[in-house]
């Protein structure tokens, strides 16, 4: 029950739509038993998929409140999924929903290997040995959830760059264009482990995003959602590096786990960018190899998807 009890509407946000979503969450929490973990996960993701597909009065909230709601949903979802997945039996689970929400989850006894979770628009690779806190006897869980609908609530969310990156960008680019807000290129994804201490991973996690086309000469950034003190948040790049990007895919490497996305910032790239090499048909052969390898994994990988839906 503790998993659900803290996931309630954010204070100060008045939305009928959001209230109904959290009513459903609380109902699921009340009825929850460990044997229902699989069904409960599906019901929560179904409810979230439907919420973000038809956000109703959420889209009439001021932008900042929308960002607070998104932050609250991402944070709570990660906690709830982590808690519930500890009651799943070993194996790989894939769920997908009509509006695009997707969950890939692997539960194992701790093993010394890397794990790859593949989805329609994202691939995640990391070492298994980071999934569990040392001394924790339970199973290890690695999860990845893609939430394309979250982009509606994160429109115009600010990007806060580290001072060093900011300086480097201003040296190599004409500077931020006037309208300022970066464009969300990819789905928003959230990655989690049974170990909730993921602020400083011993070896980095790699994400490969499939996304909308990049506008030529625009800056592509791998970002994560940093939950602010005020319960809201912003996009940030600390601990995340953009390994390479092509027209419709980008590889990111991060030293922590959170919610991630690929943004296109409004910079006009003047020349070759030392922060990020944009891969073209010519050079960058090492990165080309990574892309080719990822492409093969993408098509060979899989695991079936399960559609689960109801009314209401």
């Amino acid at each position: 029950d503790m998993t659900f009890s803290t996931w309630t509407p954010p204070p100060g946000v008045h939305s009928q739509t959001l209230s109904r979503f959290f009513d459903k969450v609380q109902d699921l929490g009340r009825d929850y038993k460990p044997g229902l973990a699989n069904n409960t996960i599906q019901s929560i993701l179904q409810a979230l998929d439907e919420l973000l597909e038809a956000p109703g009065d959420l889209e009439t909230l001021p932008r900042l409140q929308q960002h607070c709601v998104a932050s609250h949903l991402l944070d709570g979802l990660e906690d709830v999924l982590r808690g519930l997945s500890k009651n799943l039996s070993n194996g790989l689970l894939n769920f997908s929903y009509p509006a695009g929400t997707e969950l890939s989850l692997e539960v194992q006894k701790q093993v010394d290997r890397s794990v790859t979770l593949r989805q329609n628009q994202a691939v995640m690779q990391l070492d298994w040995n980071q999934a569990q806190k040392s001394g924790d006897p339970g199973p290890s869980v690695v999860g990845l959830v893609s939430i394309p609908g979250m982009g509606k609530l994160l429109a115009e969310a600010p990007l806060v760059l580290e001072p060093e990156k900011q300086m480097l960008l201003h040296e190599t680019h004409q500077g931020l264009l006037q309208d300022g807000s970066p464009i969300l290129l990819s789905d928003v994804i959230s990655a989690f482990l049974s170990n909730n201490d993921t602020q400083n991973l011993s070896s980095p996690v790699t994400f490969t995003f499939s996304h909308r086309s990049v506008i030529p000469r625009q800056k592509v950034l791998c970002v994560f959602w940093e939950h602010g003190q005020n319960g809201c948040g912003h996009w940030a790049t600390t601990g995340c590096s953009t390994i390479g990007t092509r027209d419709t895919s980008t590889i990111c490497r991060c030293t922590h786990l959170s919610s991630f996305a690929v943004l296109m910032a409004h910079y006009d790239v003047q020349e070759e960018d030392p922060v990020l090499t944009v891969i073209t048909g010519g050079g960058g052969s090492g990165l080309n190899d990574i892309f080719e390898a990822q492409k093969i994994e993408w098509h060979e990988g899989g695991g079936g998807s399960h559609h689960h839906h109801h009314h209401g």
């Epitope: 739509t17 109904r20 979503f21 439907e50 919420l51 889209e59 509006a99 009314h311 209401g312």
Partner: antibody
Framework: EVQLVQSGGGLVKPGGSLRLSCVAS????????MNWVRQAPGKGLEWVSS????????YYADSVKGRFTISRDNAKNSLYLQMDSLRAEDTAVYYC???????????WGQGTLVTVSS | QSVLTQPPSVFAAPGEKVTISCSGS????????VSWYQQLPGTAPKLLIY???KRPSGIPDRFSGSKSGTSATLGITGLQTGDEADYYC????????????FGTGTKVTVLG
């Protein structure tokens, strides 16, 4: 002010087709699920079909499944119901209605009469 | 073929209180919120009560709703001639291939 304005009703022969339209104003159309509900003369209300904001979720009542098609054009703030293979029992006033997530039909169109008769 | 059952008609004098019952099952009323709709003669239905007991803005507090288990009730106090209409309960049904279900409808007649 939320408004749903309907058109497209009329008299049609059994087996024929008709397309109903509903144009919305006064709210963010793309944020809401939309529905069609009908009412046969002198009878009660019957839910017909539902479509979510981006058309990811579409549902039909068993009585119209395979014959009716719901669709929407968010750029035009419009909802449609394509009715094929019409039968006498489809004769009714058809209403479009807005629905909030997990909630009721909070706004209704004025209704349009569809008469199926030879 | 409605799955929510309402009394066909209710009669009362102006100023009186009337209640309309709506009976369902665990897959509809027992599983979701109930709404009530008012349909004045020759007009489209209008939302009267939602989420079992909430009133949209503009609906007077003479109208109230409640739910217990698999049945719901609409109450109208201080009945007025303008309340003469058909009233329908409604909810989502989670049983296979079902969608939104309405009650059979109740005709409220204001006497005198």
């Amino acid at each position: 002010e939320v408004q749903l304005v309907q058109s497209g009703g009329g008299l049609v022969k059994p087996g024929g087709s008709l397309r109903l339209s509903c144009v919305a104003s006064g709210f963010i159309f793309r944020s809401y699920s939309m529905n069609w509900v009908r009412q046969a003369p002198g009878k009660g209300l019957e839910w017909v079909s539902s479509i979510s904001s981006s058309s990811s979720y579409i549902y039909y009542a068993d009585s119209v499944k395979g014959r009716f098609t719901i669709s929407r054009d968010n750029a035009k703030n419009s909802l449609y119901l394509q009715m094929d293979s019409l039968r006498a029992e489809d004769t009714a006033v058809y209403y479009c209605a807005r629905r909030e997530y997990g909630g009721p039909f909070d706004y209704w169109g004025q209704g349009t009469l569809v008469t199926v008769s030879s | 073929q409605s799955v929510l059952t309402q009394p066909p008609s209710v009669f009362a004098a102006p100023g009186e209180k009337v209640t309309i019952s709506c009976s369902g099952s665990s897959s509809n009323i027992g599983n979701d919120y109930v709404s009530w709709y008012q349909q004045l003669p020759g007009t489209a239905p209008k939302l009267l009560i939602y989420d079992n007991n909430k009133r949209p803005s503009g609906i007077p507090d003479r109208f109230s709703g409640s739910k217990s288990g698999t049945s719901a009730t609409l109450g109208i106090t201080g009945l007025q001639t303008g309340d003469e209409a058909d009233y329908y309960c409604g909810t989502w049904d989670s049983s296979l291939s079902a969608g939104y279900v309405f009650g059979t409808g109740t005709k409220v007649t204001v006497l005198g």
